[in-house]
């Protein structure tokens, strides 16, 4: 099915539930600009790829980023 | 528990608009995609259209491009549906969904609401 | 564009096992989550699988799915058929999301 698109923001929906890290293949923080008004936070999963939307403003997705930039603080060098 | 409630369908003629809505109750209304999907009488499914959380993305089937609108109201729970130039080929019964996306893993679907196209 | 293809109708008697599919065209069906409803008729459509092969919870594990990349095809399989299990089914993937393709339906006939 052809379709018309306005904006190119990626999210259709957002969840406030957030996901499993072990699930996770990886997490972008995508700031608005002109091409999407709003912030974004995708997580890709390693599971056909599939990406998911979470909502920013949601408390339990904020621990999940604080979660993830600490895990990854241990494995840098 | 989760309820979407279609209003404004009815028989109107061909070139005619018709406004359709779509009453959400029941979950995060401001978090979900929403969408239109029709059925004419004795045919499958087809997808119509969808517009994200926040209003911002709005896609269309080629079907209804350029003729149909969609839009919402977070602070109604309400979602609409604006058909212009209406066809015979319109005609049939119009389900507001939440459907399963990347974020939403649940369906919900409404009753539908029968839109007749003829003059 | 990618399209889904179903038979138009199955049927089967009751204990049997039937099997619906679901071809895809224009794409790689293994590459986004199928869907299957079932709708009665007059009702609206409910979800039978989601993600190729998971039941929402108060669905029997009669039904299932399937995904065989080899074909390019989905498959539902109902088990144990009952007469309550007559309706029309229809897959539904993706083209990709946010664009929601669905299949032409299939009428499962209990005999």
């Known amino acids: 099915v052809p379709l018309s698109r306005t904006v190119r923001c990626t999210c259709i929906s957002i969840s406030n539930q957030p996901v499993n890290p072990r699930s996770l293949e990886k997490l972008e923080i995508i700031p608005a600009s002109q091409f999407c008004p709003r912030v974004e936070i995708i997580a890709t999963m390693k599971k056909k790829g599939e990406k998911r939307c979470l909502n920013p403003e949601s408390k339990a997705i904020k621990n999940l980023l604080k979660a993830v930039s600490k895990e990854r603080s241990k494995r840098s060098p | 528990q989760v309820q979407l409630v279609e209003s404004g369908g009815g028989v109107v003629q061909p070139g005619r608009s018709l406004r359709l809505s779509c009453a959400a109750s029941g979950f995060t209304f401001s978090n979900s995609g929403i969408h239109w999907v029709r059925q004419a009488p004795g045919k499958g499914l087809e997808w119509v259209a969808v517009?994200?959380?926040?209003?911002?993305?709005?896609y269309y089937a080629d079907s209804v491009k350029g003729r149909f609108t969609i839009s919402r109201d977070n602070s109604k729970n309400t979602l609409y549906l604006q058909m212009n130039s209406l066809r015979a080929e319109d005609t049939a019964v119009y389900y507001c969904?939440?459907?399963?996306?990347?974020?939403?893993?649940?369906?919900?679907w409404g009753q539908g609401t029968l839109v007749t196209v003829s003059s | 564009n990618f399209m889904l293809t179903q038979p138009h109708s199955v049927s089967e008697s009751p204990g049997k096992t039937v099997t619906i599919s679901c071809t895809g065209s224009?794409?790689?069906?293994?590459?986004?989550?199928v869907q299957w409803y079932q709708q009665r008729p007059g009702s609206s459509p409910t979800t039978v699988i989601y993600e190729d092969n998971q039941r929402p919870s108060g669905v029997p594990d009669r039904f299932s799915g399937s995904i065989d990349s080899s074909s390019n095809s989905a498959s539902l399989t109902i088990s144990g058929l009952k007469t309550e299990d007559e309706a029309d089914y229809y897959c539904?993937?993706?083209?990709?999301?946010?664009?929601?393709?669905f299949g032409g339906g299939t009428k499962l006939t209990v005999l």
């Open positions: 224009g794409g790689s069906i293994a590459s986004n989550y």
């Open positions: 517009i994200s959380y926040d209003g911002s993305n709005k």
């Open positions: 969904a939440r459907l399963r996306d990347n974020a939403e893993y649940t369906d919900y």
């Open positions: 539904q993937s993706y083209d990709p999301l946010p664009v929601w393709v």
